[in-house]
């Protein structure tokens, strides 16, 4: 028997309740932002909650439907992109998710000017990506992996590609490991600002190996999936940039772009583009040993209607503590000059920071320091340069917004949100219209979310987008739990933690406690953001105390524990979770008889090797969809942080650093162990073969798959997973259901 | 090169006005700002004040506000500090110098020898 | 106006040592900026928007900090780094303000 405290104090309290685990699973305590769909400097396009499109101007005050909701739902639109020269709408239905950012779509053209669809020369479908140019009404699409470009709408499609093949060459289209682990997007092409030109990437996946996996659906045979997927060591795509004149694409045709020489010696990557002029282009690329990043801005000769690319454009950045840059490597925000930009790369002491880069990287100007991280920058004007930093009170785990005057007069640093809420708003993001002349913020947290209007040049609120209201009420009656973030130092070492309490906590009792983590490389937990989660309901009802902890290898703290991983991931995370768990049990109100650990993706590698390090320390654990072994892993993301599965390389750590390797070790521990079938990112393969040393190491476990679906184990499948991850744990922590 | 020439003394009697002057060469004076700082014999630096030559606007440190005037003879390329009813306090070396703005330097990147002014009866 | 509090007034090194020398503004600055000055000459820039080199000074020579709390650093103390360095900065501006100044003596 449990005996609880009786919680009758006063009746307010009385009137409180616990979260509860449907609260969490209906997403009864979730959370809106506002990010505004800019259209110039002063007007933005919103999706009304009855979806209308509305177009609001700031400095009118005025508003107006450009598009109703009964011509959304002719077409059972639920996404929509207004041309820039405001005569079109294409409407987006028919969405099918593919892989991370990727999906397909049908797409129709809507005329703003006659109230019509366009017909004639309708587009195909489905359509794997399609934009607007940046000025006028010029439409590119990707269809069947071959880039498409009509002048107006409805024009007969000019086919740019005529390669693009299922699996083997993508035209405008990243295939599975560029969307995922370097690009980031759904998409592989790029106009210039002014719409002259569309530059875009080949994809030859020709000799990737393949992973297959079974899709069980509802048919009498399984079908099998395909995705051309380098692991760890593997062959990698071969990637090429091309630049077309959307002018006259017949005239020349596309036009390749050349690889730096230093590039081009051995495997490489392209990382990613940007235009600076309509006449000049920015490409990045990446050795395939990812410490080495050449940026290479090349220029357009009319003359010969190529692109140049001179060896004096050229600026590398190297790292000679761990691999370039933080996840990515950062891409540059270029000057009114059009020569001189902005990046974030680690400054001498390394920490990243503002570099201002003129002519080379060697006389690159830094324009942030200290020991903290600039993060983001958001934009640059004549006049200012807006970017995110954690250097307000020196808590890492925050995000505040920056402006640094650069204009005819001292530079000069203002935070702008470090005040605005101080107690809510601790985690911002910011979206800017044109020349920031006006600009949106957005609050995470910790406290409930807020998104508001700002004046560019003043800062000035102009109004609140979204304030959460029926959250904040719905929130008034339920006992949230505490949270504290806080630092433990351990040999030189500074561990940032979030501890979740119960509502009631007590530091005179022992509690449950939970480990909650990812530890990834460059990721970070420890956040000031509001969040009701499972978590949240762990504490607030079921009592448990539940931590994250920041440990080496995580971001925005310096390289020194960024970089601590490179090449050993799987020891320095796991470590470091095992000597917070020691620090949380001398603070005395840990039941150190009941803690457990859990974490999905890299998350569920570190959870399972934490249950397998014979600390004694953990009762039981969850890992859900972890790696196993980092061989079989996706090489961009692999081999940044670990170099190759060779044995003049790497390859004995490959080996060492197995979930496979430490089975014996499962013996006194709870297990439970869970996948996706059909996960294309961390493949079902990697639980298999943990399944496996385990039953052939003779240790008893608990294991859970889900068929059918993928990384993310979405819709009835979350509902049946926390469910059951909450008995597990309800179970090993002798709580009564 | 870039050189910013100065007198070397200056002797001015108590209550007298003495006009320093800062001849630019190598660049034309009317380019950048000019700033004037004082140094006392074994003491810090002290701002005085700055003239932008293009246009003849000036700042001055509240402290030099009257004592100080700033000038720009931009046909000889030379910039002058007028220093009126001196006193023993005002006996120090006063440089010129000019601040590199172009972006993100912002420092004073050139600096005249200085002029020693002694202010004795 | 902003003060700035530079320490220790004057300190002495031995070659080879590190050196670490202080500035405190009384209210937080965006940026520091360093002068190195010695006898009978005229002030040198050294560091600008507080980490940046100045043309021509020795790598050995570092700027830091943020807010209130900046410092200049010389890896490895040489003969020729015996002078008097000055901070400096804009954020009050106008007036600009200098520290009043660090000696540093070669041991």
């Known amino acids: 028997i449990v005996l609880r405290p009786s919680r009758v104090h006063n009746s307010e309290e009385n009137t409180m309740r616990a979260l509860t685990l449907k609260d969490i699973l209906n997403g009864t305590f979730s959370y809106k932002t506002f990010f505004p769909n800019w259209i110039s400097g002063q007007e933005y396009l919103h999706q009304s909650a009855d979806n209308n499109i509305v177009l609001y101007n700031i400095e009118t005050g005025q508003s107006y439907t450009i598009l109703s909701n009964r011509t959304m739902k002719s077409v059972n639109a639920s996404n929509y992109g207004l041309s820039p020269d405001r005569q079109f709408v294409y409407l987006e239905s028919d969405y099918s998710k593919l892989w991370r950012y990727s999906y397909t779509a049908t797409y129709y053209i809507y005329d703003l000017s006659n109230g019509e669809f366009v017909r004639g020369n309708e587009l195909p479908r489905p359509i794997q990506y399609l934009c607007w140019s940046p000025v006028g009404s010029k439409l590119a699409y990707v269809y069947q992996n071959n880039i498409y470009l009509k002048q107006r709408p409805g024009d007969p499609p000019f086919q740019i590609t005529f390669n693009g093949r299922e699996n083997k060459i993508f035209n405008g289209i990243p295939d599975w490991v560029y969307e995922e682990e370097m690009l980031a997007t759904k998409y592989a092409l790029w106009w210039s600002p002014n719409g002259k030109f569309l530059a875009y990437a080949e994809f030859n996946d020709t000799d990737i190996p393949v992973i297959a996996y079974s899709y069980y659906g509802d048919e009498q045979y399984p079908r099998t999936i395909n995705i051309p997927y380098p692991k760890a060591g593997a062959k990698n795509p071969v990637v090429r940039i091309f630049i077309i004149d959307t002018t006259y694409p017949a005239y020349v045709g596309p036009q390749e772009v050349p690889v730096p020489a230093m590039i081009a010696s051995s495997d490489y990557y392209f990382s990613w583009l940007t235009w600076v002029t309509d006449e000049r282009v920015c490409l990045q690329w990446l050795k395939r040993v990812q410490n080495v990043s050449v940026l290479s801005i090349c220029d357009f000769r009319e003359d010969w209607q190529t692109w140049d690319c001179p060896k004096t454009q050229e600026h590398i950045e190297e790292s000679r503590t761990g691999w370039a840059g933080g996840f990515f490597v950062s891409t540059p925000v270029f000057s009114y000059d059009a020569i001189s930009y902005y990046k974030i790369f680690s400054d001498k002491d390394g920490y990243k920071h503002i570099h201002y880069i003129k002519d080379t990287v060697e006389n690159a100007i830094q324009i942030t320091s200290g020991k903290w991280e600039a993060i983001n920058i958001f934009r640059v004007t004549q006049d200012s340069l807006f970017y995110s930093s954690n250097e307000f009170e020196e808590y890492p785990g925050r995000r505040n917004i920056y402006r640094i005057s650069i204009g005819s007069y001292p530079p000069s640093k203002k935070c702008v949100t470090c005040h605005l809420r101080k107690e809510r708003c601790q985690y911002y993001t910011a979206s800017f219209s044109d020349y920031a002349k006006y600009y949106a913020l957005v609050c995470y947290g910790p406290g409930i979310p807020i998104s508001t209007l700002h004046d560019g040049r003043t800062d000035q609120e102009i109004k609140i987008l979204e304030e959460n209201k029926e959250l904040e009420n719905a929130l008034k009656n339920i006992q949230l739990p505490k949270e504290e973030i806080k630092k433990l130092e351990v040999d030189e070492i500074t561990l940032w933690y979030k501890m979740i309490l119960p509502p009631q906590f007590d530091r005179s009792k022992k509690y449950p406690l939970l480990i909650q983590v990812y530890g990834g490389p460059c990721s970070q937990s420890v956040r000031s953001v509001f969040a009701v989660n499972w978590i949240s309901y762990l504490a607030s009802k079921e009592g448990m105390v539940i931590a994250l902890v920041d440990g080496r290898g995580t971001a925005f703290q310096g390289d020194k524990l960024l970089y601590a991983v490179y090449r050993k991931l799987g020891v320095y995370e796991v470590e470091d979770q095992i000597t917070a768990v020691r620090k949380f049990i001398e603070m005395g109100f840990i039941d150190e008889k009941r803690i457990a650990i859990w974490g999905w993706s890299y998350g569920g590698y570190v959870s399972s090797l934490a249950l397998a390090s014979g600390t004694g320390l953990f009762k039981c654990g969850i890992a859900v969809a972890p790696v196993s072994s980092w061989e079989y892993y996706a090489s961009v993301y692999t081999e940044r942080f670990m170099g190759l599965p060779t044995k003049d390389d790497n390859l004995e750590h490959y080996k060492n650093s197995t979930v496979m390797a430490r089975a014996e070790y499962f013996r006194n521990v709870d297990y439970l162990l869970i996948h996706g079938t059909a996960d294309d990112n961390v493949h079902f393969q990697n639980s298999a073969q943990i399944a496996k040393a385990l039953v052939n190491a003779q240790v008893d476990f608990q294991a859970m798959w889900y068929s059918d679906q993928n990384h993310g184990l979405s819709g009835l499948s979350t509902n049946h997973l926390y469910t059951h991850m909450t008995h597990f744990l309800k179970q090993c922590f002798s709580l009564s259901d | 090169q870039v050189q910013l020439q100065q007198p070397g003394a200056e002797l001015v009697k108590p209550g007298a006005s003495v006009k320093l002057s800062c001849k630019a060469s190598?660049?034309?004076?009317?380019?950048?700002?000019l700033h004037w700082v004082k140094q006392r014999p074994g003491q810090g630096l002290e701002w005085i004040g700055e003239?932008?030559?293009?246009?003849?606007?000036?700042n001055f440190s509240e402290k030099f506000e009257i004592k100080a005037t700033l000038t720009v003879d931009s046909s000889s390329n030379t910039a002058f500090m007028q220093l009126s009813r001196l006193t023993s306090e005002d006996s120090a070396v006063y440089y010129c110098?000019?601040?590199?703005?172009?972006?993100?330097?912002?420092?004073?990147?050139?600096w005249g020898a200085g002029t020693t002014v002694t202010v004795s009866s | 106006q902003i003060v700035l509090t530079q320490s220790p007034a004057l300190m002495s090194a031995s070659p080879g040592e590190k050196v670490t020398m202080t500035c405190t503004a009384s209210?937080?600055?965006?940026?520091m900026y360093w002068y190195q000055q010695k006898p009978r000459s005229s002030p040198k820039p050294w560091i600008f928007?507080?980490?940046n080199l100045a043309s021509g000074v020795p790598a050995r020579f570092s700027g830091r900090g943020s807010g209130t709390s900046f410092s200049l650093t010389i890896s490895s103390m040489e003969a020729e780094d015996a002078a008097t360095y000055y901070c400096?900065?804009?954020?009050?501006?106008?007036?600009?303000?200098f520290g009043s100044g660090t000696k540093l003596e070669i041991k």
């Open positions: 110098t000019r601040l590199d703005d172009s972006r993100f330097h912002w420092y004073f990147d050139v």
């Open positions: 190598g660049y034309t004076i009317t380019s950048y700002s």
């Open positions: 003239i932008n030559p293009a246009n003849g606007d000036h």
């Open positions: 209210s937080s600055v965006s940026y």
């Open positions: 928007l507080t980490s």
């Open positions: 400096q900065q804009w954020s009050g501006y106008p007036p600009i303000t």
